[in-house]
């Protein structure tokens, strides 16, 4: 029987009965938060052989071994993981051994066994026989091995029953408990599983099998299971499902996600029955089960319960992440915030269509509306009183609507209203009328020419650059001296610059009124000599990097015909010169014969130009005498050079620091103080432990269902 989707056993140990007939758990298995110590000896689930996702055990009092519960658990597939782990055993106060003596394969993911004060038989299990890679395993804070005295079956009687393998250069017996060896298949089987009698299974079997070389006798399948047979790929007209079995179209057509309150149904894509079309694809029609590629970003319709969505913070904007069509009205009211422009762009930048109206009021933090960088249509199906579908009121720092040279926005129905936007030039509003097709809809009072743009330099003159010089990390630019009608009104210039890999930046990118700005700013005083052109040396730049630069004149707010005059340049794109690249990364060398070396490396992280070739130098080194100090034919252990790995288990450091013989002298030395790198590694380790524990708690402590 296939059980699932995911089984969560908590609070009451009798819930374990839910596992009674399960052979495969399609999903995860959680056993957790059972605080009353119980006798688990009457609970045994010999039918369970496979868990397709992960196994999590957390705070189960009284449970001393998993071997009696799951004597035949053979494979944990790890199709979905718990924080990168397929097996998590955490804070199991009474667990004495893992005891999963039939566990032969964890297909994906690592293991995390942490804070189990009584847990032994960890150093006797060779996880490399079960997992592909053991480097990500995390086994920390359990009972110290010195206190365990783990003995494998038959060792005391000097008739050892288990096989030996090498872990961390220790060749030893491998077992799960005092009476259960760790099963190993004959080397003749290679990567294949084997029966209890050491006969090799069919290549499509995983973990074990009941008969040799038979694809219908597998305990679990290496690839996919279909109609009692393990197959390398799903047969025609069947589809991969949940990473382990093949299902037909009818099955896929009738299932729904239990995680959603909609009934959208699964889709078939690329031979797989899946919950959603993958990124970049969309369902091919409402009744379709198939996916087609999206043109541009995939549409995502978002709807607001109350018809009007108020965006007054980054948190409220977050709800719109990924939305391309917003059914309803947008009310934007951003009075303050940190890095607000780029945050809003991140969460609202994909919106293309708003079906109702857009209202921006009291948004003093906004300098531009360019964060709505894909908005192309306001339908105006619902309008504000007075038939307005675009309403902009009292935004003290709003200077730009959009970059109209690169923007197509249509307002299908309704009028526009602009008032009390002191830094928004009326010319900018008129330009919006032209682009959006609303010209002629507005009445005289809808666009107030007196209180829009009254504090902006709307009549801008253009500053022209006169020269540019570059080096690897500097740019020198000069520009024409700006001469306003009254020379005294010119105070200084401000140069704005930033990295711009593409020539598509605008003045207002990433800028808000609360101090966030993606542009670097430098003030340039007027040269005292009236005949000298103003200029600047920008230094500390990156080699071979394109920068965008523009200059603004800082003038007195001199009003002339109700408007302030100002001046600024176009945006100039300029690239610094190339320089010496940084060193090539990850250099590895290996010998593949007595006369050859293979050397591999990755490109430098900072090429600082277009790389054309590499220079490889080599020289012969004298042989290391260390290699001759040991008789490799003797049975003694081969000496191992130990390198500090920078991490320690705090709980296990109980002895005094060891003294070592140093240098040529025979006297003892103190243990060396920890290096900065070691301290940093310890700090990161502690941080990582906290992050995992938070993730665990957030995942499993959930509100009680109503």
């Amino acid at each position: 029987e296939i059980c699932g989707p995911g089984i969560d056993i908590r609070n009451d140990y009798q819930q374990l009965k839910r596992l009674e007939n399960c052979t495969v758990i399609e999903g995860y298995l959680h056993i957790l938060l059972i605080s009353k110590a119980e006798d688990y000896r009457s609970y045994r689930f010999p039918k369970l052989t496979v868990i397709t996702e992960y196994l999590l055990l957390f705070r189960v009092a009284g449970l001393e071994s998993l071997g009696d519960l799951f004597p035949n658990l053979t494979v944990i597939r790890g199709w979905k993981l718990f924080y990168n782990y397929a097996l998590v055993i955490f804070e199991m106060t009474n667990l004495k051994d893992i005891g999963l003596y039939n566990l032969r394969n964890i297909t994906r993911g690592a293991i995390r066994i942490e804070k189990n004060a009584d847990l032994c038989y960890l150093s006797t299990v060779d996880w490399s026989l079960i997992l592909d890679a053991v480097s990500n395993n995390y086994i920390v804070g359990n009972k110290p091995p010195k206190e365990c005295g783990d003995l494998c079956p038959g060792t005391m009687e000097e008739k050892p029953m288990c096989e030996k393998t090498t872990i961390n250069n220790e060749y030893n017996y491998r077992c799960w408990t005092t009476n259960r060896c760790q099963k190993m298949c004959p080397s003749t089987c290679g990567k294949r599983a084997c029966t209890e009698n050491n006969e090799c299974c069919h290549p499509e079997c995983l973990g074990s099998c009941s008969a040799p070389d038979n694809d219908t006798a597998c305990v679990a399948c290496r690839h996919y299971y279909y109609a009692g047979v393990c197959v390398p790929a799903c047969p025609p007209n069947t589809y991969r499902f949940e990473g382990w079995r093949c299902v037909d179209r009818d099955f896929c057509a009738n299932i729904l996600s239990a995680e959603s309150s909609d009934s959208e149904g699964f889709v078939i894509h690329d031979g797989e029955c899946m919950q959603e079309c993958p990124s970049g694809f969309i369902r091919n029609g409402s009744q379709s089960m198939y996916c087609i590629p999206c043109e541009g970003p995939c549409p995502k319709v978002c709807e607001e319960e109350k018809k009007t969505k108020t965006i007054d913070s980054v948190t409220s904007a977050q709800m719109l992440q990924g939305c391309t069509i917003f059914k309803g009205n947008l009310l934007i009211n951003i009075r303050r915030g940190n890095n607000i422009a780029s945050e809003l762009e991140n969460f609202m930048g994909l919106i293309e269509v708003v079906t109702g109206y857009v209202k921006i009021r009291h948004s003093h933090a906004l300098v531009s509306l360019s964060f709505l960088k894909n908005l192309r249509l306001i339908l105006g199906e619902e309008q504000l009183e007075g038939n307005y579908s675009f309403y902009v009121l009292d935004n003290q720092n709003l200077q730009q609507l959009w970059d109209w040279d690169h923007r197509n926005l249509t307002i299908k129905a309704g009028k526009m209203y602009f008032a009390f936007n002191p830094k928004l030039c009326v010319s900018e509003i008129y330009r919006m009328e032209e682009v959006t097709g609303t010209k002629g809809r507005q009445s005289k009072g809808d666009i107030n020419t007196r209180n829009n743009g009254e504090r902006a330099s709307c009549e801008s003159d253009v500053l022209h650059f006169t020269s540019t010089t570059t080096s690897k990390n500097r740019i020198i630019i000069t520009w024409h001296r700006y001469r306003p009608p009254d020379y005294r009104d010119l105070i200084s210039f401000t140069v704005y610059y930033k990295e711009a890999p593409f020539k598509n930046v605008t003045e207002y990118d990433g800028q808000d009124a609360c101090g966030s700005n993606s542009w670097n700013m430098v003030d340039v005083d007027l040269p005292p000599n009236k005949d000298v052109e103003p200029g600047i040396l920008l230094h500390g730049l990156k080699p071979w990097t394109q920068y965008a630069v523009y200059v603004k004149a800082v003038t007195l707010t001199m009003v002339e015909n109700d408007h302030i005059r100002g001046a600024k340049s176009e945006i100039l794109y300029i690239r610094t010169n190339a320089s010496v690249p940084s060193i090539p990364l990850d250099v590895l060398s290996a010998s593949n014969s007595s006369s050859q070396l293979i050397v591999k490396w990755n490109p430098p992280s900072l090429p600082n130009g277009n790389l054309s070739y590499y220079i490889v130098r080599w020289q012969r080194q004298p042989q290391d005498g260390y290699l001759y100090r040991h008789n490799y034919c003797s049975k003694d252990k081969i000496p191992i050079r130990k390198y500090a790995d920078g991490t320690i288990d705090i709980e296990e450091v109980t002895e005094n620091p060891k003294t070592e013989v140093c240098g040529g002298e025979k006297g003892p030395c103190c243990a060396c103080p920890k290096t900065e790198a070691e301290k940093q590694a310890e700090k990161e380790e502690a941080e990582y432990r906290k992050v995992f524990e938070n993730f665990l708690h957030n995942s499993i402590f959930v509100p009680r269902p109503e």
Partner: nanobody, 128 residues
Framework: EVQLVESGGGLVQPGGSLRLSCTAS????????MAWFRQAPGKEREGVSA????????YYADSVKGRFTISRDNAKNTLYLQMNSLRAEDTAVYYC?????????????????????WGQGTLVTVSS
């Protein structure tokens, strides 16, 4: 509080038609999947038809395919089931149900566990 009220049931002759309605209140109707179930005397409750909220994708039990049509009007918060070519075996109490989030994984559209809210039901009798 979520409330579902079914209507439109009654006595009809074999081959006849009926249209059931289910009006919902207390929820954002346009975001929930919905379904019709039925329970004949002495039998298990079974799924008849379901419909998604976002795309209107529909599902039907084999026994009603081609005869019944499910639809919804999100503006009126109403779910419909148009039943044509009725047969005696269609006699049952028909229930309207609303989807709910139900943990991880998946389930078949006709599994009652996927639905969190239920109406009181309306009786449909097909008899000559």
């Amino acid at each position: 509080e979520v409330q579902l009220v079914e209507s439109g049931g009654g006595l009809v002759q074999p081959g006849g038609s009926l249209r059931l309605s289910c009006t919902a209140s207390g929820l954002t109707f346009g975001t929930f999947g919905m379904a019709w179930f039925r329970q004949a005397p002495g039998k298990e409750r079974e799924g008849v038809s379901a419909i998604s909220a976002s795309s209107g994708r529909t599902y039907y039990a084999d026994s009603v395919k081609g005869r019944f049509t499910i639809s919804r009007d999100n503006a009126k918060n109403t779910l419909y089931l148009q039943m044509n070519s009725l047969r005696a075996e269609d006699t049952a109490v028909y229930y309207c149900a609303v989807r709910s989030k139900n943990g991880a994984g998946y389930g078949f559209w006709y599994e009652a566990r996927l639905y969190g809210y239920w109406g009181q039901g309306t009786l449909v009798t097909v008899s000559s």
